[in-house]
């Protein structure tokens, strides 16, 4: 696992950053775990970063992710509606200069090094559930969420609204 101290060092610097001229509403350093309390961890392998979903040993420290929250206009999907809505989007960065990206072609979630402004693939619409879990919907592909598949993060198409609460797209954010 990597990036814990690195993230904390650059949290302050990110406060001054802007993405296409928009500053984040807030930033939050948190560990990310699944609905079933498995941890999301990040490891350097063969010069690229891998993302794992795993049970941590008792005293093993959780990796932290910097979530940056942005406000965006919510495009109404019904003609004639008043376009009054806003949505919250987040970017997720486990270490300096690296962000989670949606690879819609491969249905995968990847860590990419990139400069500002970040591409749309790095933005996820945040949903919070009655269970106080959250889910992350791809900005570039509405109806597709970050989820867990075979101990990895993957992009999962939520076919019907009834499946919005399906456990494999629910995550917990924790400061500890």
């Amino acid at each position: 696992a990597f990036g814990i101290s690195g993230v904390q060092k650059y949290t302050r610097a990110l406060h001054d950053s802007s993405i296409t001229g928009i500053s984040p509403i807030t930033e939050y350093l948190a560990s990310l775990s699944t609905y079933n309390d498995q941890s999301i961890t990040f490891a350097l392998e063969d010069e690229s970063y891998e993302i794992y979903v795993e049970d941590l040993k008792k005293d093993e420290k959780k990796d932290k992710v910097l979530l940056s929250y942005y406000e965006s206009q919510h495009p109404s999907n019904e003609s004639g509606d008043g376009v009054d809505g806003k949505m919250l989007m987040v970017t997720l960065s486990p270490t300096k200069d690296f962000w989670l990206h949606a690879n819609n072609k491969e249905h995968s979630v990847e860590l990419h090094k990139c400069e500002k402004p970040l591409p749309d693939q790095a933005f996820f619409v945040l949903h919070n559930m009655h269970s106080n879990c959250v889910s992350f919907e791809c900005k570039t592909d509405p109806g597709v969420f970050i989820g867990v598949k075979d101990n990895h993060l993957a992009l999962i198409k939520v076919d019907s609204s009834e499946n919005l609460c399906t456990e494999n797209i629910l995550f917990k954010l924790s400061e500890t």
Epitope: D84, L88, L126, E162, L164
Partner: antibody, heavy 122, light 107 residues
Amino acid sequence: EVQLVQSGAEVKKPGASVKVSCKASGYTFSDYNMNWVRQAPGQGLESIGDINPKNADTFYNQNFKDRATLTIDKSTSTAYLELSSLRSEDTAVYYCARHYYYGSSYGGFVYWGQGTLVTVSS
Amino acid sequence: DIQMTQSPSSLSASVGDRVTITCHASQNINVWLSWYQQKPGKNPKLLIYAASKLHTGVPSRFSGSGSGTDFTLTISSLQPEDFATYYCQQGQSYPLTFGQGTKVEIK
């Protein structure tokens, strides 16, 4: 223009039930949770719970878990609150309210209905 | 549940005064706090969301600040139409909870 229009005032006897409606217009009904909040005379605001119109997933505040039922009718973009086993302390104005953010409660309630006064008296 | 505690519960002030209302959350809610104004017989109106963001159409004399557990609503120069009751509300986690309200009265 977004509007939440509630049904009219009700007078009920203790032990009866009441059903309050909230008709939404001006936005995509299924995109935002519908919340219900009540306010007893001279008192503060108290959350009853909310419903996600996409999948009818509900959350009830502990105080209302046994007596409140939240439902929706997607065909008419209407949300309903039914409160059973009414007692005098349920006398209050009941409001429906829509979240500010799509998919999230974090931004509070931006649109409110005009309120429905429910009076419980024998 | 997250408890929201507002203070004071009421205050008397004059037109032109600077008024400050505080709200304390029993646990960290980041910036996910909203402020509402309510006048007698009317529904609440959103003033501030995300702790400091002014809702559309709200006069700039209203401002909000804070994060974590402690938040403030400030009215820089009280106007006659500002005499009302003000509520804070956390949106971070269910159940969503309100402060008990602060009534701003004419001195």
